[in-house]
């Protein structure tokens, strides 16, 4: 169930941003990577450093895929694994990191016009929590490559980032994924420190834009290793 998934996550503390929310000085509310919990004078984000169980790629983060942790391992035991970078071996598109796709068993860079969904894929959602449509009718969304003459705009349901238009990525929104803006310089980002680590991010962020990387904010260097705020910064 949802609660057992939540409780399986370890909590790490982040120091409160100076002058209110990061990037939003003086704000009365917090701005934070992924899903941030204000607790007392600390800010907390959920990060899970145990393997995150999954049944399909769509249950994992934008920089992960779902597979057995061992080669030829039990197919019934699958976890979210870190995506594979360019020139690494792959068996399917989802194994490759955002901006790449699987071609002839190797992760290669996606060209702007490439759309990975050559076959029709269906989003079906079944979670421990209830999720009903506001008008009371159930909804089943089928994504077909035929629909993708134009890529998904902001807010469109997606399977992976290549489904979204330029400047957008496919990120978790509750228990679906939608196209959201790629992070700009100075915006707070989520840094998963370990391979295979998975934050239960109900309101997930995109990755940093081109020429940017998610690094510790300079004025947070004094903080302990486990409590550092990360922002998108120039290489």
């Amino acid at each position: 169930t949802l609660n057992s998934v939540l409780n399986s996550n370890a909590i790490k503390n982040l120091p409160p941003p100076l002058g209110g929310a990061a990037g939003h000085p003086g704000s009365a509310v917090s701005a934070a990577p992924g899903i941030l919990y204000p607790g007392g004078n600390k800010y907390q984000t959920i990060d899970n450093y145990q393997p995150y169980p999954c049944a399909e790629d769509e249950e994992c983060g934008t920089d992960e895929y779902c597979a057995s942790p061992t080669r030829g391992g039990d197919a019934g035991v699958q976890i979210c694994l870190a995506c594979r970078k360019r020139r690494k071996r792959c068996m399917r598109h989802a194994m490759c990191c955002p901006g790449n796709y699987c071609k002839n068993g190797i992760c290669v860079s996606s060209d702007q016009n490439h759309f990975r969904g050559e076959i029709e894929e269906t989003i079906t959602e079944s979670f421990g929590n209830d999720h009903s449509t506001l008008d009371g009718y159930s909804r089943r969304t089928t994504l077909s490559s035929k629909m993708y003459h134009t890529k998904g705009q902001e807010g469109s349901v997606c399977l992976r980032s290549s489904d979204c238009a330029s400047g957008l990525c496919c990120a978790r929104h509750f228990w679906s994924k939608i196209c959201k803006p790629v992070l700009k310089e100075g915006q707070v980002c989520t840094k998963h420190r370990r391979k295979g680590s998975h934050g239960l991010e109900i309101f997930q962020r995109c990755y940093c834009g081109e020429g940017l990387s998610c690094r510790i904010q300079k004025d947070h260097h004094q903080a302990s290793n486990s409590s550092r705020l990360h922002t998108c910064q120039r290489h």
Epitope: A22, L36, D135, R139, E154, H173, S176, Q187
Partner: nanobody, 117 residues
């Protein structure tokens, strides 16, 4: 700047009802959706209910299904949590959060709900 303000908390007897409100002000970007979370003393924060303006869906934790109802008005930047058949285990500080299209996630300061047996 965006500010989220919760209200409606209080002390209520088991079996009673409360309606929480969360109002967002200062928004210059649209919101994808909003959610309610809670933290009981000595426990981890947990998701309670959510509403997605973008997808037209509502979401509930198993523990509140059938008792709590989330609703709202994106145009008015407001979300509500109607809590019926309250139980002592619902006692917690309730927070609302917003998934914003400017890539930041905003949190309110919380409102205390206490259910006596």
């Amino acid at each position: 700047e965006v500010q989220l303000v919760e209200s409606g908390g209080g002390l209520v007897q088991a079996g009673g009802s409360l309606r929480l409100s969360c109002a967002a002000s200062g928004r210059t970007f649209s919101s994808y959706g909003m959610g309610w979370f809670r933290q009981a003393p000595g426990k981890e924060r947990e998701f309670v209910a959510g509403i997605s303006w973008t997808l037209g869906r509502t979401y509930y934790a198993d523990s509140v299904k059938g008792r709590f109802t989330i609703s709202g008005d994106n145009a008015k930047n407001t979300v509500y949590l109607q809590m019926n058949s309250l139980k002592p285990e619902d006692t917690a500080v309730y927070f609302c959060a917003s998934d914003e299209s400017d890539a930041y996630n905003y949190w309110g300061q919380g409102t205390q709900v206490t259910v006596s047996s």
